[in-house]
Amino acid sequence: SAHLHPRDSCPLGPGRCCHLETVQATLEDLGWSDWVLSPRQLQLSMCVGECPHLYRSANTHALIKARLHGLQPDRVPAPCCVPSSYTPVVLMHRTDSGVSLQTYDDLVAQGCHCA
Amino acid sequence: SAHLHPRDSCPLGPGRCCHLETVQATLEDLGWSDWVLSPRQLQLSMCVGECPHLYRSANTHALIKARLHGLQPDRVPAPCCVPSSYTPVVLMHRTDSGVSLQTYDDLVAQGCHCA
């Protein structure tokens, strides 16, 4: 919509708004140690932080959601911080015939927005 | 991942988990009355509700986010309910030369998932 403009500056202060953050997790944390061999530890980029009015709005739906949340906060939730894109990750895992490589397209976030 | 299975039954009770809900909004609510002519009122389908562990997980990222939220709730947020697809909406709006129709592909949610 030409009449609602998403913004990129965080009104809540540094690091408070929707952004990418790296979380370290082991295969044990993920419950994957029985089938994934490597890497043993993953640097998982995830989307965290708040989505104040018009901040990094994903699309028109997110813009109107933000607006309606301001009018009906009990009825309409604020937009929330979710991945806008992903970076592929290759895992080495056990198979019936030995070891195999597989690429996961939707495991590690590359960018975030408010949806 | 073959080892984390998203689920479709809500453990919190009917209507509590992530689902599509219709919110009625006027052009005035949206701040669009100066440029949109019709419809005067919109039935906006939006995604609302909670995302308990493994419920309607959007993808592998959402599954591991749910898992890590269980382990590090202060560090990793729970997945949240966002549109998985949209349904197009045609709006009639003012232009410099008169009236025009425009289709918005990302205004009204059609399905929801936890991301």
Epitope: R40, V89, L91, V99, S100, Q102, T103 | -
Partner: antibody
């Protein structure tokens, strides 16, 4: 500086054994996998296989399974490619490459080792 | 195994030309495709990863697109240093495979 340095060119006879090396420096060797790639004279690139130096897990392309052995010694940050019995058709340039499993690409390459097998 | 077919196998172009190289996978590989450039006597160099992401330090005249089975590498304005052989590479699942290469020569 992050780099992979490969051992020098080799001239061998058919039936002989050979082990070429690829030494990583400037980064934590066990944090990245190493792949080997073959390029026969005037030809394209062929993926041979991969090793996780931290656990020495290896995966081979079916074309190279049983023909070569990929190994690593993490104590000296070195990966190896070896043959027990060379053939004339093994004549090629062999490259090692560091694998970034985030993004899934070969980000650092060795300079290549030319292996010539001739009677 | 997934077969990667590049076209053309070679092309002649002039400095300033827009060059497009295509790569087709024998089955869907999502966006799990890289592009490498190789000059004679040198090791390959990564240009594009995940189908469309430009590797750090690579000039912006290089771009990649596509998903599924069909992919494209575009050089918007060919420079003298771009005359080389270009390879696509799939890493959707093992065994990983390269395309046969496209040689870009001076017209």
């Amino acid at each position: 500086e992050v780099q992979l340095v490969q051992s020098g060119a080799e001239v061998k006879k058919p039936g002989e054994s050979l082990k070429i090396s690829c030494k990583g420096s400037g980064y934590s060797f066990t944090d990245y996998w190493i792949s080997w790639v073959r390029q026969m004279p005037g030809k394209g690139l062929e993926w041979m296989g991969i090793i996780d130096p931290s656990g020495s897990y290896t995966i081979y392309s079916p074309s190279f399974q049983g023909q070569v052995t990929i190994s690593a010694d993490k104590s000296i940050s070195t990966a190896y490619l070896q043959w027990s019995s060379l053939k004339a058709s093994d004549t090629a340039m062999y490259y090692c490459a560091r694998v970034s499993y985030y993004g899934g690409y070969f980000d650092i390459w060795g300079q290549g080792t030319l292996v010539t097998v001739s009677s | 195994d997934i077969q990667m077919t590049q076209s053309p196998s070679s092309l002649s172009a002039s400095v300033g030309d827009r060059v497009t190289i295509t790569c087709r996978a024998s089955q869907s590989i999502s966006n799990n495709l890289n592009w490498y450039q190789q000059k004679p006597g040198k090791a390959p160099k990564l240009l594009i990863y995940a189908a469309s992401n430009l590797q750090s330090g690579v000039p912006s005249r290089f771009s990649g697109s596509g998903s599924g089975t069909d992919f494209t590498l575009t050089i918007s304005s060919l420079q003298p240093e771009d005359f080389a052989t270009y390879y696509c590479f799939q890493l959707d699942h093992s065994p990983f495979t390269f395309g046969q290469g496209t040689k870009v020569e001076i017209k």
